[in-house]
């Protein structure tokens, strides 16, 4: 692949690998990608220090790099046609693995604007100076190179691989060798944290002199967010050494029996974990002191705890149990407030609906709006209500006063309106006369 010697640093939930080799940025990214990673991000000062550590490791292994000022690709690039934005920390560049822009940057010098070609970022290492945590590698921007022509002073690249979690390194209680094989195909005998899904091969013994016994373990998730090998007790234990070799592989105390056997133990305030090697702070939460949906939260160094309630609940006087908060006490609603377990809801009176400025506000329902009117004829909206009206010749009717009923003028309260015959019609009436009579011009009398 053109990428040679590599160094590894694993910390938190990520591993960084440094590789030497004169590759273009695209070739370097492809190399990282093939093993499930990307060219490294440097999103904070802490991450810059991790990257510097892995580069320092690489430089210790590399006999001689050709250039005094050496460059190593990281995953910061700007596509062709995308212009420089001096107002942003990343100046318009973005991380190849995606993710949001970050406030940290460490540019070597003021960037020149150029949108005509893709630009890539490398870390600039001055090999004449020791690598110090206070002097982090600067970011240098330039052409991305092409196969066979990586660009001036490009000496390698840094990859980053992210994991669900990490296992502690395996503890040896006697002579032996551990070899870790990571999911990104790196083998190492010394990792301060070992990534999830790594394999560990343990060969016990002192080479040819002893019978070698071997073990194989995988770093796996034993329970949610609990990563462990599943080995129990120190490995490669030997009566010849007892507790004298690497403290018997014990995390804290090692207790020897008379027969050369030994057991691991813990200092006061700590307990021995299932691996029979590691000690953890006695967890005051393990007795489940919190009740009613409260979550137990460990205090500093695992010495004490507090109970935390879900949103909408608060601790009661015992500070152990959760009780519902009556949010309605604070009158958060414009009209009606209904307290519910873990929350509340606002309701509006009849004639109002949720809306208007502010949380829990209510606005008048326009019952007379187009297509919504409950009235048969006229409708007038009022605050919180409405009223119906009828055209001439009709009166309001119905239980809810929304219907209009024709007035029978022929049987009106003032007696007959017509002198002779009266014909009621929808919304009106007309008069008529018996044969031989003619309706007068007033439309009422007969002549």
């Amino acid at each position: 692949t053109g990428a040679d010697t590599e160094a590894v640093v694993c910390v938190g939930t990520a591993c960084y690998t440094a590789h030497s080799g004169k590759l273009s940025a695209a070739e370097a990214q492809n190399h990282c990608n093939q093993n499930g990673g990307n060219l490294a991000t440097v999103k904070s000062k802490e991450e810059a220090q991790h990257v510097q550590r892995v580069l320092a490791q690489l430089l210790r292994r590399e006999a001689a790099l050709t250039a005094r000022m050496s460059k190593f690709w990281i995953g910061l690039q700007r596509e062709k046609g995308k212009c420089l934005d001096p107002s942003l920390p990343l100046k318009g560049f973005s991380w190849v693995g995606g993710g949001e822009d970050t406030p940290y940057s460490n540019w070597h010098k003021e960037l020149r604007n150029s949108c005509i070609s893709k630009r890539c970022v490398s870390l600039l290492l001055d090999l004449s100076q020791p690598l110090l945590p206070s002097r982090l590698p600067k970011w240098s921007e330039g052409p991305c190179g092409s196969p066979g022509s990586p660009g001036s002073n490009i000496e390698g690249f840094v990859c980053k691989f992210s994991f669900k979690g990490m296992c502690r390194p395996l503890a040896l209680g006697g002579p032996g060798q551990v070899t870790y094989t990571t999911p990104f195909q790196t083998t190492s005998s010394s990792l301060e944290a070992v990534p999830f899904a790594s394999a560990a091969n343990v060969a016990c013994g002192e080479g040819d002199k002893d019978e070698t016994q071997s073990h194989y373990f995988l770093c796996k998730e034993k329970a949610p967010d609990v990563f462990d090998w599943g080995s129990s007790g120190p490995l490669c234990v030997s009566p010849k050494y007892g507790c004298n070799f690497n403290n018997g592989g014990c995390h804290q105390d090692c207790f020897e029996g008379g027969d050369g056997s030994f057991l691991c133990g813990c200092r006061p305030g700590f307990r021995l974990l299932d691996d029979l090697v590691t000690c953890a702070s006695r967890n005051p939460c393990s007795s489940s002191p919190c009740r009613g949906g409260a979550t137990c939260v460990l205090g500093p160094h695992g010495k004490n705890y507090t109970c935390r309630c879900p949103q909408g609940y608060q601790l009661d006087s015992s500070q152990l149990d959760c009780v519902d908060v009556d949010e309605c006490q604070d009158s958060p609603c414009a009209q009606e407030c209904v307290n519910t377990p873990g929350g509340f809801r606002c309701e509006c009176w009849v004639g109002y609906e949720p809306g208007g400025p502010g949380e829990g506000a209510c606005q008048d329902v326009d019952e007379c709006a187009l297509g919504r009117s409950p009235c048969a004829q006229g409708c007038t909206n009022t605050d919180g209500s409405f009223h119906c009206s009828c055209e001439e010749g009709y009166v309001l009717a119905g239980e809810d006063g929304t219907q209009c009923q024709d007035v029978d003028e022929c049987v009106g309260p003032g007696g007959p309106l017509c002198d002779s015959l009266c014909f009621n019609t929808q919304g009106s009436f007309h008069c008529g006369c018996l044969p031989g009579w003619v309706l007068a011009p007033n439309g009422v009398s007969c002549t």
Partner: antibody, heavy 118, light 112 residues
């Protein structure tokens, strides 16, 4: 598709032992926990152990420790559950169940009825 | 061990009506990562259990959306919004936060 195929029903004498197999197919056998859950007639479910086929790591329910052994054969993608010192209380349907990445038990074998007779 | 209490032991609901099953745990199942490790399984006669809901409220593949899960750290509810004939089964809650994994005693759901 994911399949867990268990061995057939067994009738065994009290005090004896039984070995039930579970053959997995359709997924990366080495990368998922295989749990064992049992169900006595008309009763609920009880978890009693699991194995990680990748390296053979096991965890057991303390209630059964010393009586149950889980082993795996990666060449045939099979897990074996052996339960010793059987009593009538151990009469149950035994299920092998895959544990997924969400810690759910997503695929279940068809079950193996073990009847302990006196 | 984490102990769970499932209620009711049995439940009869009319077709099309809402069915609610509860489960209470002796310890919060809410992990510091924000995930609640509570699961619901359905078991029909003569069949192995089937995963319905994982991590308190997520519907397993192929499960109808009339099923839903909710709850807090220790109290959980499985709801079937409109009961269908094929929902007749025994329902179990379970926790996979801490070993040993434990199950509720089961709720038998029948049609009224």
């Amino acid at each position: 598709q994911v399949q867990l195929v268990q061995s057939g029903a067994e009738v065994v004498k009290s005090g004896a032992s039984v070995k039930v197999s579970c053959k997995a197919s359709g997924y990366a056998f080495s990368s998922y926990w295989l749990n064992w859950v049992r169900q006595a007639p008309g009763q609920g479910l009880e978890w009693f152990g699991r194995i990680y086929p990748g390296d053979g790591d096991t965890d057991y329910n303390g209630k059964f420790k010393g009586r149950v052994t889980l082993i795996r054969d990666t060449s045939t993608s099979t897990v074996y559950m052996e339960l010793t010192s059987l009593t009538s209380e151990d009469t149950a349907v035994y299920y092998c169940v895959r544990g997924d990445g969400y810690w759910a038990m997503d695929y279940w074998g068809q079950g193996t009825l073990v009847t302990v007779s006196s | 061990d984490i102990v769970m209490t499932q209620s009711p032991d049995s439940l009869a609901v009319s077709l099309g009506e809402r069915a609610t099953i509860n489960c209470r745990f002796s310890k919060s199942l809410l992990h510091s990562n924000g995930i609640t490790y509570l699961y619901w399984y359905q078991q029909k006669p003569g069949q192995p259990p089937k995963l319905l809901i994982y991590q308190m409220s997520n519907l397993a593949s192929g499960v109808p959306d009339r099923f839903s899960g909710s709850g807090s750290g220790t109290d959980f509810t499985l709801t079937i919004s409109s009961l269908q004939a094929e929902d007749v089964a025994v329902y179990y809650c379970a926790q996979n936060l801490e070993l040993p994994w434990t199950f509720g005693g089961g709720t038998k759901l029948e049609i009224k």
